[in-house]
């Protein structure tokens, strides 16, 4: 599927089939300064025995041959999901007893900045991506993933933590954003909508996709997530949009087929190891990158976001399974678990490819409004 007004070689399209549909043009006025109220807040968590504070439940990294899940979470607060918001909302809910990040959910009061002051920061995530405003950065090389192909054993923990479905990843999954920018994958989780309602966190020219996968990584410069929180580049998230396609996605089916087992909030199961890279687009060379935050409390900033230009295709049935199987707290469906897009506040999104060049007949000449901050090599 292509976004409206997509160019021939436009960013963001064509799932792992390889064709590149760009994210669309970016000549619209920026709405960075007005976060949309109609989009719910998001959340994201990192792996571990307990859910960490926010968008990513972040674990402590331990030596590889420890227990099957080797990564243990810090003693961070657990996260609560929202009741099934009929309309996405911009605030997170906390249980009355908690004044920390341990209890929040999508929708309702109190506002997230009262859950965690960082949520009111100037450089938050997610954001709306406007390809024509992105700065082409030749220095952004193809991402490198190593060790993402996992044998069936040891098995991995798949958990409904009340605000997402999260797969805890074992040690040894290495990712490089570039020379000297090395990370270890901790966990992955998904964000989705509801029937007929898209639920990606990031948007492209205001277009929201059906769902979004986040693979959360910790910089190798840090041994533990709590050390990396808020530090520039301490955490990195690979994000990809999920779209509807004609065929079942066999990689995702290995996870989606197990969701019924963890329908209840707080439940978990073990799933055979799989090729984690198969859950991502095949084109690691075309992406958008910017510095933002966790999309749930504590909303820590300094997170490097890499959003693939290419999308991943799932069947309609698979997308329905994702959005219609899990339950959150209070007998509510776990749906619409995404945060509103946040203002860029002067941030420039970089692109690893000339995303702002419109090859369609409308454009007399390429338009690239921002220049790359990092010099090319």
């Amino acid at each position: 599927q292509r976004l409206p007004r997509m160019q021939e070689d436009s960013p963001l399209g064509g799932g792992s089939s390889g064709e590149d549909d760009p994210l669309g043009e970016e000549d619209l006025p920026s709405e960075e300064d007005s976060p949309r109220e109609e989009d719910p807040p998001g959340e994201e968590d990192l792996p571990g025995e307990e859910d960490l504070p926010g968008e990513e439940d972040l674990p402590e990294v331990k030596p590889k041959s420890e227990e099957e899940g080797s990564l243990k979470l810090e003693d961070l607060p657990t996260v609560e999901a929202p009741g099934d918001p009929q309309e996405p909302q911009n605030n997170a809910h906390r249980d009355k007893e908690g004044d920390d990040q341990s209890h929040w959910r999508y929708g309702g009061d109190p506002p997230w900045p009262r859950v965690s002051p960082a949520c009111a920061g100037r450089f938050q995530s997610p954001v709306d991506i406007r390809p024509q405003l992105a700065a082409f950065c030749p220095a952004l090389r193809p991402l490198e993933l190593l060790g993402f192909q996992l044998p069936p054993l040891p098995e991995l923990r798949l958990r409904n933590n009340g605000h997402s479905v999260q797969l805890t990843l074992p040690p040894g999954l290495e990712m490089a954003l570039g020379p000297g920018r090395e990370y270890r994958a901790l966990q992955l989780h998904l964000h989705w909508g509801a029937a007929g309602r898209p639920g990606s966190e990031h948007t492209v020219e205001g277009h929201r996709f059906p769902a979004e996968i986040h693979v959360v990584h910790l910089s190798t410069a840090f041994a533990r997530v709590d050390e990396a929180l808020g530090r520039p580049g301490g955490l990195a998230v690979l994000a990809a949009f999920l779209e509807e396609g004609p065929e079942e996605n066999s990689a995702y089916e290995q996870l989606l087929s197990r969701l019924e087992e963890i329908a209840e909030e707080g439940s978990e199961t073990q799933v055979p190891g799989l090729d984690i890279s198969a859950l991502l687009p095949s084109d690691f060379s075309r992406y958008f990158q910017y510095e933002g935050s966790l999309t749930t409390p504590p909303c820590a900033q300094g997170v490097i976001w890499t959003v693939f230009n290419q999308t991943v295709m799932l069947s309609a049935k698979q997308l329905h399974t994702l959005s219609d199987t899990l339950w959150g707290p209070g007998d509510s469906r776990l749906q619409l678990n995404f945060r509103a897009t946040q203002p860029l506040n002067g941030r420039v999104i970089e692109a690893s490819f000339p995303a702002g060049v419109d090859s369609s007949p409308r454009a007399a000449e390429p338009v690239q409004l921002n220049s790359c901050l990092a010099a090319g090599d």
Partner: antibody, heavy 116, light 111 residues
Framework: QVQLVQSGGGLVQPGGSLRLSCAAS????????MSWVRQAPGKGLEWVSA????????YYADSVKGRFTISRDNSKNTLYLQMNSLRAEDTAVYYC?????????WGQGTLVTVSS | QSVLTQPPSVSGAPGQRVTISCTGS?????????VHWYQQLPGTAPKLLIY???NRPSGVPHRFSGSKSGTSASLAITGLQAEDEADYYC???????????FGGGTKLAVL
């Protein structure tokens, strides 16, 4: 410290059966996948079978599929390999091993001889 | 014949450096599955020497190192010692066979 103590090997006739055991200690047994690996006399290592920590998933080499059954009793911290319809080519030292990042701990091995 | 191919034997004098290769295919090492190495001293059970391509378990001397490139992996031993005389096996996972696979083993002789 991690220990895997094996028992149950011996001499058996072709077509016969044997059950190997592997008693584990020093770690949370149910948290780990386990495996059986064998080594024929003078030969190299051959993976035989593996089982997930919960026991819910099992895997077999083609050479033993349908004849061998791997199982575990997490309440007893014990891994088993039930070997049926044994053949001469099954003669080997059988090792149990903990499957984490690689097979990180091994039992002492037990010899299974299939001969008439 | 093993799925992963190793030289049957290698040798070196004390203090020297030797490498043992392990060649696979696009369904195992080349697909990105991790490679592990084991040392088996005569009459004993194998011992994990290198895991996940390059990592040493605690207690394994720094003289042992692993690397991987394409469809092959290598084990390097520097400062060879008499007690290194043993059989060495590489191991990975094969997605076509849906099985954990070993190399045929390499006998290291310290001259």
């Amino acid at each position: 410290q991690v220990q895997l103590v094996q028992s149950g090997g011996g001499l058996v006739q072709p077509g016969g059966s044997l059950r190997l055991s592997c008693a584990a200690s020093g770690f949370t047994f149910s948290s780990y996948a386990m495996s059986w690996v064998r080594q024929a006399p003078g030969k190299g290592l051959e993976w035989v079978s593996a089982i997930s920590g919960s026991g819910g998933s099992t895997y077999y080499a083609d050479s033993v599929k349908g004849r061998f059954t791997i199982s575990r009793d997490n309440s007893k911290n014990t891994l088993y390999l039930q070997m049926n319809s044994l053949r001469a080519e099954d003669t080997a030292v059988y090792y149990c091993a903990r499957a984490a990042a690689g097979f990180d701990y091994w039992g002492q091995g037990t010899l299974v001889t299939v001969s008439s | 014949q093993s799925v992963l191919t190793q030289p049957p034997s290698v040798s070196g004098a004390p203090g020297q450096r030797v490498t043992i290769s392990c060649t696979g295919s696009s369904s195992n090492i080349g697909r990105g599955y991790n490679v592990h190495w084991y040392q088996q001293l005569p009459g004993t059970a194998p011992k994990l020497l290198i895991y996940d391509d390059t990592n040493r378990p605690s207690g394994v001397p720094h003289r042992f190192s692993g690397s991987k490139s394409g469809t092959s992996a290598s084990l390097a031993i520097t400062g060879l010692q008499a007690e290194d005389e043993a059989d060495y096996y590489c191991q990975s996972y094969d997605s076509s066979l849906r099985a954990w696979v070993f190399g045929g083993g390499t006998k290291l002789a310290v001259l």
